[in-house]
């Protein structure tokens, strides 16, 4: 039943063009090029895409035409290497062009920039957007793909096609509405927020494959799919895991056409085999392709089968545990993970993986002991503290969130994380802590049974953002250690970090705490970021400051901003009152 065993094709580019259709082919090639060459102008990418598309059409007409037998990486890489300004714009990335495939492609992949130096996307007026949409719908939508892809070089390409479809639908509907802005802006906000979340989730999948490998990704997939499809048999889950791993390996490896094609095949397979997978798929499977794939990826967990037997029988009490383990270690551990996960939709995936690792370590030790059964008999008792640790952490943090609200909860985390890893850049600390703080509104509203999978798996995504941003410019050995030692223990590793006693406080710089009237015209979110940036800088100057001291300074700061934004001469107020605030803050913190 292997979905991916295809006949060999004389021309890979013709094969993918025919499978995907011209529209999707062009969109995916644009995404691929924008994710590789993130600084190139839109027009240059469109030109390259058109050239590749015209070439693909000649191969569709005659698969044995010249160069049609070349691999996609060879064709795309050759095209990227024709860019005239490669050396000036990208520096050493230009050296990739001296390499042969597949080294050249992996060289390009390694130069993807998670934090490219690109201007923030500013949303034009609604009328301006609607005019642009009506004037040239195709260019408008291509521009969307380009701008998202270059800022999110690991965005899941077939999912970006789904976002673009929704983006188009929003403009089609709202540009005809009586109140265009009221119709369009909430939709665009939703797409932006969902897009950022989707990008971050995919970045974790790619990081998992890049840094920890296929086995780590497959273990994650076994746990997640077993929770989602608890009625499916182990063989079925294993098959889905193999196919899903192939899809994500392709997308993370820049093979976007193959990835989109295989994702469509996988959705087709899942829908054709719903009966043996899940009862929750019916609605998803009635949708068109892009919606169907998205729906399947987000589908709720199916109900657990009634009367599942105790796990202990097969994995602790059986006399054949060591025999079964020795015969096929990965299969036996996979079965353990499957059985545990399908019984525990209330656990996070990372917790399930920690339990499986503990079980594996115990078997490795005990199956070499004189009395293996005696040695591993109490293995399930070792799980208790591992389960309680995230439960307690989530309970405490949800209580804190409910007490403080999102903004102040974010501030508490900003202080906490700045004290743990003060060497990390202020923008990164602000971005990551704000996202960590969003766990409260996202997960604390859920009942107990859904809190842990929501919270801890979300935190894994956010901490991965910290890891990939830090990897670009490493400044903290503690961050490197937590990010590289174990994928599933990243969150406990960061949670366990105490104040960094080796940190030498930053020199005080009044300029950092000088504010101007422009803060008054910022959105609430931007104003919060300004204040949170100041808070991080305060902690970097005075890492031993107490919560009370920091709260007093931040309250004074909020009052200062409010006062000066109401003043007639705002700029003068900011200059004069600002000096007083800096002096008072220095005194309050003993600087």
């Amino acid at each position: 039943r292997g979905v991916f065993r295809r006949d060999a094709h004389k021309s890979e580019v013709a094969h993918r063009f025919k499978d995907l259709g011209e529209e999707n082919f062009k969109a995916l090639v644009l995404i691929a090029f924008a994710q590789y060459l993130q600084q190139c102008p839109f027009e240059d990418h469109v030109k390259l895409v058109n050239e590749v598309t015209e070439f693909a059409k000649t191969c569709v007409a005659d698969e044995s035409a010249e160069n049609c037998d070349k691999s996609l990486h060879t064709l795309f890489g050759d095209k990227l290497c024709t860019v005239a300004t490669l050396r000036e714009t990208y520096g050493e990335m230009a050296d990739c062009c001296a390499k042969q495939e597949p080294e050249r492609n992996e060289c390009f992949l390694q130069h993807k920039d998670d934090n490219p130096n690109l201007p923030r996307l500013v949303r034009p007026e609604v009328d301006v957007m609607c005019t642009a949409f009506h004037d040239n719908e195709e260019t408008f939508l291509k521009k969307y793909l380009y701008e998202i892809a270059r800022r999110h070089p690991y965005f899941y390409a077939p999912e970006l096609l789904f976002f673009a479809k929704r983006y188009k639908a929003a403009f089609t509907e709202c540009c005809q509405a009586a109140d265009k802005a009221a119709c369009l802006l909430p939709k665009l906000d939703e797409l932006r927020d969902e897009g950022k979340a989707s990008s971050a989730k995919q970045r974790l999948k790619c990081a998992s494959l890049q840094k920890f490998g296929e086995r780590a990704f497959k273990a994650w997939a076994v746990a997640r799919l077993s929770q989602r499809f608890p009625k499916a048999e182990f063989a079925e889950v294993s098959k889905l895991v193999t196919d899903l791993t192939k899809v994500h390996t392709e997308c993370c490896h820049g093979d976007l056409l193959e990835c989109a094609d295989d994702r469509a095949d996988l959705a087709k397979y899942i829908c054709e085999n719903q009966d043996s997978i899940s009862s929750k798929l019916k609605e998803c499977c009635e949708k068109p392709l892009l919606e169907k794939s998205h729906c399947i990826a987000e589908v709720e967990n199916d109900e657990m089968p009634a009367d599942l037997p105790s796990l202990a029988a097969d994995f602790v009490e059986s006399k054949d545990v060591c025999k079964n383990y020795a015969e096929a270690k990965d299969v036996f551990l996979g079965m353990f993970l499957y059985e545990y996960a399908r019984r525990h939709p209330d656990y996070s995936v990372v917790l399930l993986l920690r339990l499986a690792k503990t079980y594996e370590t115990t078997l490795e030790k005990c199956c070499a002991a004189a009395d293996p059964h005696e040695c591993y008999a109490k293995v399930f008792d070792e799980f208790k503290p591992l389960v309680e640790e995230p439960q307690n952490l989530i309970k405490q943090n949800c209580e804190l969130f409910e007490q403080l609200g999102e903004y102040k909860f974010q501030n508490a985390l900003l202080v906490r994380y700045t004290k743990k890893v003060p060497q990390v850049s202020t923008p990164t600390l602000v971005e990551v802590s704000r996202n960590l703080g969003k766990v409260g509104s996202k997960c604390c509203k859920h009942p107990e049974a859904k809190r842990m999978p929501c919270a801890e798996d979300y935190l894994s995504v956010v901490l991965n953002q910290l890891c990939v941003l830090h990897e670009k410019t490493p400044v903290s050995d503690r961050v490197t250690k937590c990010c590289t030692e174990s994928l599933v223990n990243r969150r406990p590793c960061f949670s366990a970090l105490e104040v960094d006693e080796t940190y030498v406080p930053k020199e005080f710089n009044a300029e950092t705490f000088t504010f101007h009237a422009d803060i008054c015209t910022l959105s609430e979110k931007e104003r919060q970021i300004k204040k949170q940036t100041a808070l991080v800088e305060l902690v970097k100057h005075k890492p031993k400051a107490t919560k009370e001291q920091l709260k007093a300074v931040m309250d004074d700061f909020a009052a200062f901003v409010e006062k000066c934004c109401k003043a007639d001469d705002k700029e003068t107020c900011f200059a004069e009152e600002g000096k007083k605030l800096v002096a008072a803050s220095q005194a309050a913190l003993g600087l």
Partner: nanobody, 125 residues
């Protein structure tokens, strides 16, 4: 720990063939990816070919495609590289390497944790 020992190198004329072997001992399980790299004097170490231990999927450097074949014998825990139609530019020390995790980037030497000591291949008339 995994130990890798290559053999089969030597001097061969252009157009000739050689078969390199790499015997793996220690814990090699189904998650492994095995690869061949080569290094010519004064040059960087270069990827040649790789194979997934689990499913036998293979990948090759463009310039060796159609001339070299990577394979493995699971029972003997041995990796092979059959090299045909050898050229002067294939002259290098050939290394066998193992990535126990099958990480995404298979051409990157840093992703391979275990290495053999290398075997010299010289193509000359």
């Amino acid at each position: 720990e995994v130990q890798l020992v290559e053999s089969g190198g030597g001097l061969v004329q252009p157009g000739g063939s050689l078969r390199l072997s790499c015997a793996a001992s220690g814990r090699t399980d189904s998650a492994y990816r095995m690869g061949w790299f080569r290094q010519a004097p004064g040059k960087e170490r270069e990827f040649v070919s790789a194979i997934n231990w689990s499913d036998g999927r293979t990948v090759y450097l463009d310039s060796v495609k159609g001339r070299f074949t990577i394979s493995r014998d699971n029972a003997k825990n041995t990796l092979y590289l059959q090299m045909n139609s050898l050229r002067a530019e294939d002259t290098a020390v050939y290394y066998c390497a193992a990535d126990p995790d099958s990480r995404l980037y298979y051409t990157v030497p840093q992703n391979y944790d275990y290495w053999g000591q290398g075997t010299q291949v010289t193509v000359s008339s």
